[in-house]
C-alpha cells in the first residue's frame, strides 16, 4: 500500500485508490470553467492541449483566474459552499475566470488516502498552469488558487510545482491531520505562491485538529481564535437539524473559513480586520489592535500582499453570521485599590455609547486576573457601527447566582473576612478602536466619585481625543 | 444517544444466504459510514467494507467484495448486509460500527449477530 | 495489507496494576492506531482513537502512545472492569486491518 510521498517519487503510479473501485472512465482531475453562477449550468472542461474549448467557453486570458480546490469528500458531490464560492466570485470579478478543480473520484476516499492524492493532483494542476503560460497575454501573476481542508495543500503542490509562481494561494482552513509538522514540501508553505494567506477556523489542541495549527503562509488568520466559532456551538447546530452532533460542529467550524471568504467578497463594504498577535491570548486581553507596520490586514480576498521574513499569525473575533465584520476594541483600565483587598475576580460589563448606536451590555473577560494600582488591558467588541463613542457605562456585576460565583464570592471574604466592603477606584478608561485606530480617554462623570464596588456602576465621559491627559505622567504599569 | 441495533442470530444452510440488518439511531444517518467487521469465534476481527448513506458509496475489502453486498433503506435509517454462498468459514458473530471522519475509527458499535452455517 | 501484530495475546496482571499492551504495523501508519476493548459479553468500545486521544466517556486510566509503526496502551491502574481483551487497529489505509487481540486476566 502507499504511502505519504515525498517531493521526489514518481507521479503517475501515485493514484491511492483500493482496486476495488479502479473502475473509472472519467479523468481522476477534471478543470471545470464556470461559466455561469447557476449551479445547474455545467460550464465547460478544459482539456490540456485543446485550445479550442478556452476559445469556446470565452476563456479570458488577460483576466484573473482563480482555481477552486475542495478537499477530502465523505459524500463524493460538490458541497454547497463550493456554489457559494462561485457565485460570489463571479459578482466581484465579472471579468474572471473561474475554474473548480474536480479531483471527487481521489478526494472520495477513506481521508488518508485522499490525502496521498493530494500531490497527483497538485501535478496535474501544474501542468494546466504550464500550458496556459504558453498561450499570449497569460500571466500566473494573475493566478489565484483557492483550497479549502485537504485543497489548500493540493494547491501547495500546484504552487511548489508550477513553473514559474503563482501570484497568490488562499488556504482555507488548510486539512491538519497528517500536515501538522510536515516538512514545507508536504504542505501548503510560503515558497508555494508570491502571496499566500490562511484562515484557520478549526484548530483543538485537544482530540484531532481537522484544520492545521501552525502557521503556514504569509499570513494565518485565526478568527474567533482559531477555534470555537460562534453559531457552531452544540446547541447551535441542534436548533437546526433533527440532530446535532460533533460532526456537524466539525463541519460549520471547517467550513467557516469558506463563509469568511464569501463575506470578503460580496460584502466589500463591510471588510473584516485582522490584528497581528503572538498568541490568542494576548489578542483576548486586548493587547494587539496596532495597525503600524503591517500589523492589521483585511481578511479574506481584500487581505493586502505581506511577505514577511516570518510568518504572521493574526486574530479577530467575528460575528455568527454574515456579515461577519466586527468592531474592535481595546480599554485599558487603571484600577486602584486603597485597601489590600487580596485576590480579587470582579465581573465587569461594559456598555458603550455612541453617535450611531449604544453597544448592548458586554463582559470584560478576564484572560488572567484583574491586576490592583496597575494599568488592565481588556478587549470588546460590537457587531454593530457605534460611531464615534460618547460615554462608558461600567458595571460591576452583584452576587450572581451560579455556583461559580458564590465560590469566588466565598473565597474572597475567606481571604479576607475583616474587609466587608469591596471597592475598586476607576478614574478613567482608554479605549482604542481596532477599526480606526482612534485612541479615546474617558473620565469618570463625577471626579469626587470614582470607586466602584458588586453591584454598583461608573459611568464615563468622553474627555479628551487621545490618550495622554494634561500634567500626566505615565501610569504605573503600561502594557504594550 | 447513538445506538446501532442489530438483527438476531441466524442458524443457516451451507450454499443459502443471509441477510443481516443494522438499524441506527441517535444521529443524522446519512452522514456517517456504516461499517461491517467480522469476528470468528475465539479469534480476531476482519473488516469487511463500509456503505456511506449520504451518496450510497460502498467499499469493500477485496476478500469480502464476492462474499458480502451492503445496501440500506435512508427510510428505515437501517444499513443490511447480505452474505451469499454460505460456508462454515462464514460462522462469526458480525458487527456494524459507526465511522468517526479523519479519525479513521469505529467510535460505536452494534452488539453483533451471530450466524452459524450447519447442515 | 497492512499487518498488524499484537505480540501478546494473553496477558495477566493484578488489580492496581499498571498494564502495558503493544501493537506493531507492518509499515508506518501516520498515527492512525485506534484501540477497542471487547468486553466479556462480546460488547465492544472505543478507547483510543489517532494514538493518544482519548474517546468521550473512557476514563482517564487509559491512554496511548506511539508513532511509525509502534504503538502501545497503557491502564495506569488496573480495575476490575478492565478485564477484557483489547484490539488496535489501523486507519490508515484500506483495508482497515486489525491486531490479533490480547486477553487481559486478573492474576
Known amino acids: 500500500s502507499p504511502t505519504p510521498f515525498g517531493p521526489e517519487g514518481q507521479l503517475e503510479d501515485e493514484l491511492h485508490k483500493p482496486k476495488a473501485i479502479q473502475t473509472e472512465v472519467k479523468p481522476s482531475v477534471r478543470f471545470n470553467l464556470r461559466t455561469s453562477k447557476d449551479p445547474e449550468h455545467e460550464g465547460c472542461y478544459l482539456s490540456l492541449g485543446h485550445s479550442q474549448p478556452l476559445e469556446d467557453c470565452g476563456f479570458n486570458m488577460t483576466a484573473k483566474t482563480f482555481f477552486i480546490i475542495h478537499g477530502w469528500t465523505m459524500s463524493g458531490i460538490f458541497e454547497n459552499w463550493l456554489h457559494k464560492l462561485v457565485s460570489a466570485l463571479h459578482t466581484r470579478e465579472k471579468d474572471a475566470n473561474v475554474v473548480v478543480v474536480d479531483w471527487l473520484p481521489l478526494a472520495h476516499q477513506l481521508y488518508t488516502d485522499a490525502v496521498n492524492n493530494t500531490r497527483v493532483v497538485g501535478h496535474s494542476i501544474a501542468r494546466m498552469l504550464d500550458w496556459l503560460q504558453e498561450k499570449d497575454d497569460f500571466s500566473l501573476e494573475n493566478v489565484h488558487l483557492i483550497g479549502y481542508s485537504l485543497g489548500a495543500h493540493v494547491a501547495g503542490y500546484a504552487g511548489n510545482f508550477v513553473k514559474g509562481t503563482v501570484g497568490r494561494i488562499t488556504g482555507l482552513d488548510p486539512a491538519g491531520p497528517m500536515f501538522e509538522g510536515a516538512d514545507i514540501h508536504k504542505r501548503l508553505s510560503p515558497d508555494d505562491a508570491d502571496f499566500v494567506d490562511v484562515l484557520h477556523t478549526y484548530t483543538r489542541s485537544f482530540g484531532l485538529s481537522i484544520g492545521i495549527q501552525m502557521p503556514v503562509g504569509h499570513i494565518d488568520i485565526y478568527p474567533n481564535g482559531g477555534d470555537f466559532q460562534p453559531g457552531c456551538g452544540l446547541n447551535d447546530v441542534l436548533g437546526s437539524m433533527a440532530y446535532g452532533t460533533i460532526t456537524e460542529v466539525v463541519k460549520c467550524e471547517h467550513e467557516r473559513a469558506v463563509h469568511l471568504f464569501v463575506d470578503s467578497l460580496v460584502n466589500q463594504d463591510k471588510p473584516s480586520f485582522a490584528f497581528q498577535c503572538t498568541d490568542s491570548n494576548r489578542f483576548k486581553k486586548g493587547i494587539c489592535l496596532s495597525c503600524r507596520k503591517n500589523r492589521c490586514n483585511s481578511i479574506g480576498y481584500n487581505a493586502k500582499k505581506m511577505r514577511n521574513k516570518r510568518n504572521s499569525k493574526m486574530y479577530l473575533k467575528t460575528r455568527a453570521g454574515m456579515p461577519f465584520r466586527v468592531y474592535h476594541y481595546q480599554m485599558k483600565i487603571h484600577v486602584f485599590s486603597y485597601k489590600n483587598m487580596g485576590e480579587i475576580e470582579p465581573t465587569f460589563y461594559v456598555t458603550l455609547y455612541g453617535t450611531n448606536a449604544d453597544s448592548q451590555t458586554l463582559p470584560l473577560e478576564i484572560v488572567e486576573r484583574i491586576e490592583q494600582n496597575a494599568t488592565n488591558t481588556f478587549l470588546v467588541y460590537t457587531e454593530e457601527d457605534l460611531g464615534d463613542l460618547l460615554k462608558i457605562q461600567l458595571t460591576w456585576e452583584g452576587a450572581s447566582q451560579s455556583w461559580y460565583n458564590l465560590w469566588k464570592e466565598l473565597r474572597s471574604y475567606l481571604s479576607q473576612p475583616h474587609n466587608p466592603g469591596r471597592e475598586l477606584n476607576i478614574r478613567r478608561i482608554r479605549v482604542k478602536s481596532g477599526e480606526t485606530q482612534r485612541k479615546l480617554t474617558f473620565c469618570a462623570e463625577d471626579p469626587e466619585n470614582t470607586s466602584i464596588s458588586p453591584g454598583r456602576e461608573l459611568w464615563f465621559r468622553k474627555c479628551r481625543d487621545g490618550w495622554r491627559m494634561k500634567n500626566e505622567t505615565s501610569p504605573t504599569v503600561e502594557l504594550p | 444517544q447513538v445506538q446501532l441495533q442489530q438483527s438476531g442470530a441466524e442458524l443457516v444452510k451451507p450454499g443459502a444466504s443471509v441477510r443481516l440488518s443494522c438499524k441506527a439511531s441517535g444521529y443524522t444517518f446519512t452522514k456517517y459510514t456504516i461499517h461491517w467487521v467480522k469476528q470468528r469465534s475465539g479469534q480476531g476481527l476482519e473488516w469487511i467494507g463500509w456503505?456511506?448513506?449520504?451518496?450510497?458509496?460502498?467499499k469493500y475489502n477485496e476478500k469480502f467484495k464476492d462474499k458480502a453486498t451492503l445496501t440500506a433503506d435512508k427510510s428505515s435509517r437501517t444499513v443490511y448486509m447480505e452474505l451469499s454462498r454460505l460456508t462454515s468459514e462464514d460462522s462469526a458473530v458480525y458487527f456494524c460500527a459507526r465511522h468517526e471522519e479523519y479519525t479513521n475509527s469505529l467510535a460505536y458499535w452494534g452488539q453483533g449477530t451471530l450466524v452459524t452455517v450447519s447442515a | 495489507d497492512i499487518q498488524m501484530t499484537q505480540t501478546t495475546s494473553s496477558l495477566s496482571a493484578s488489580l492496581g496494576d499498571r498494564v502495558t499492551i503493544s501493537c506493531r504495523a507492518s509499515q508506518d501508519i501516520s498515527n492512525y492506531l485506534n484501540w477497542y476493548q471487547q468486553q466479556p459479553d462480546g460488547t465492544v468500545k472505543l478507547l483510543i482513537y489517532y494514538t493518544s486521544r482519548l474517546h468521550s466517556g473512557v476514563p482517564s486510566r487509559f491512554s496511548g502512545s506511539g508513532s511509525g509503526t509502534d504503538y502501545s496502551l497503557t491502564i495506569s491502574n488496573l480495575e476490575q472492569e478492565d478485564i477484557a481483551t483489547y484490539f488496535c487497529q489501523q486507519g490508515y489505509t484500506l483495508p482497515w486491518t486489525f491486531g490479533g487481540g490480547t486477553n487481559l486476566e486478573i492474576k
Open positions: 456503505f456511506y448513506p449520504g451518496s450510497d458509496s460502498i
